[in-house]
Amino acid sequence: MAVTACQGLGFVVSLIGIAGIIAATCMDQWSTQDLYNNPVTAVFNYQGLWRSCVRESSGFTECRGYFTLLGLPAMLQAVRALMIVGIVLGAIGLLVSIFALKCIRIGSMEDSAKANMTLTSGIMFIVSGLCAIAGVSVFANMLVTNFWMSTANMYTGMGGMVQTVQTRYTFGAALFVGWVAGGLTLIGGVMMCIACRGLAPEETNYKAVSYHASGHSVAYKPGGFKASTGFGSNTKNKKIYDGGARTEDEVQSYPSKHDYV
């Protein structure tokens, strides 16, 4: 029961986390205009990974996409890449984990296969969460660097006496959403990995049984199913003796000590 709960909770937590990563990636408020000790403007700026926006005092908001790819800072491109990789890995992880859920029966899928898939999705969630946290942290570091640079030089000269306003930017809501979402995805991934251990059936030790065939005396030694891989060394139709001989095709699935569904 505990394993099923851990797996289910891991899935839900990861799902929320990945939804958050997607939301953060799409949000426009990665950086927002710093209102403290700045010239008071009639407009409010905020920027995302894909476009920058300006909200006027009337509430009218206008956004412009970054229509260039080569003209963008390498760091911004790196953040975009990290977030997209995080989303893709997370999405694949979700897909895999759906089939791995113990409460969902798909054909005659064995616990070993489910354990395998749970571990795979768990690792994917962990990497996805790390990608999101890394992406958001890189962007935050970029903001901090630019903030202090623009604080040191609030107004940049444009030749002669003409000056231009240097707008300073601070952390936007998307950064916090990204950090929390990345953390949740990471936690969900860890929970899936923990659940994987409980899902894996204990290794069965089969005693070697010898039987006498009409011509030769042959001892068959089974290669007990490996829980970690889900694949045994037995090939199709090789006899495995456990008291009553039957082929692998005929082996019945008995409930394990973890199976309560």
Epitope: V40, A42, V43, N45, S57, G59, Y155, Q163, V165
Partner: antibody, heavy 119, light 113 residues
Framework: EVQLVESGGGLVQPGGSLRLSCAVS????????MHWVRQAPGKGLEWVAY????????YYADSVKGRFTVSRDNAKNSLYLQMNSLRAEDTAVYYC????????????WGQGTLVTVSS | DIVMTQSPDSLAVSLGERVTMNCKSS????????????LTWYQQKPGQPPKLLIY???TRESGVPDRFSGSGSGTDFTLTISSVQAEDVAVYYC?????????FGQGTKLEIK
């Protein structure tokens, strides 16, 4: 039709106080920021103060800071300008102006009310 | 504070003539976030309150004749009247609507010869 009607102007002695009012109609007053702009006789325009729709942002020209207070009553569709410690240089026609939806422009102006500061 | 300087102070032109007036700001009024210039032009006829002509430096307010056009970016702006009419006699003001305190130029007076 958008209408802004200023009132409360008149003759006042230096150091005195005056409260200007602006009655608004023809639009949803509570959705727009409002400005006060003045124009001394024969001179150019001078921006005085701004108050946002929800009164969260209030800004003043340096020349009136600490002496003038802008306020609004959204329920009464009214804008106010409380003027204290008046000086001769405050003599002007005071306009009540709506902040436009686009471009932070000042799109609708009242006819103005004359304030004369003289002894 | 941003200082707005208009030139010339006054000009007299003949009817149908093309006229341009300039406005220069001490700081850039360009907003990179939306690629807009926060400069506005007003027309004030004698005995009347000012009237909004152009916002965002080049966008005509609805109801304004298309002979009026605005241009420029950053710190240098121009108001052009392609063919002056008798009713265009007025004082024209530019205004910084980007940084508080909002500031006006001293005005350009347009007269007919």
């Amino acid at each position: 039709e958008v209408q802004l009607v200023e009132s409360g102007g008149g003759l006042v002695q230096p150091g005195g106080s005056l409260r200007l009012s602006c009655a608004v109609s023809g639009f949803t007053f509570s959705s727009f920021g409002m400005h006060w702009v003045r124009q001394a006789p024969g001179k150019g325009l001078e921006w005085v103060a701004y108050i946002s729709s929800g009164t969260t942002n209030i800004y003043y020209a340096d020349s009136v800071k600490g002496r003038f207070t802008v306020s609004r009553d959204n329920a009464k569709n009214s804008l106010y300008l409380q003027m204290n410690s008046l000086r001769a240089e405050d003599t002007a026609v005071y306009y009540c102006v709506r902040s436009g939806y686009y471009g932070s422009s000042l799109d609708y102006w009242g006819q103005g009310t004359l304030v004369t500061v003289s002894s | 504070d941003i200082v707005m300087t208009q030139s010339p102070d006054s000009l007299a032109v003949s009817l149908g003539e093309r006229v341009t007036m300039n406005c220069k700001s001490s700081q850039s009024l360009f907003q990179s976030g939306n690629q807009r210039n926060y400069l506005t032009w007003y027309q004030q006829k004698p005995g009347q309150p000012p009237k909004l002509l152009i916002y965002w430096a080049s966008t005509r307010e609805s109801g304004v004749p298309d002979r009026f056009s605005g241009s420029g970016s950053g710190t240098d702006f121009t108001l052009t009247i392609s063919s002056v009419q008798a009713e265009d006699v007025a004082v024209y003001y530019c205004q910084n609507v980007y940084i508080y305190p909002l500031t006006f130029g001293q005005g350009t007076k347009l007269e007919i010869k």
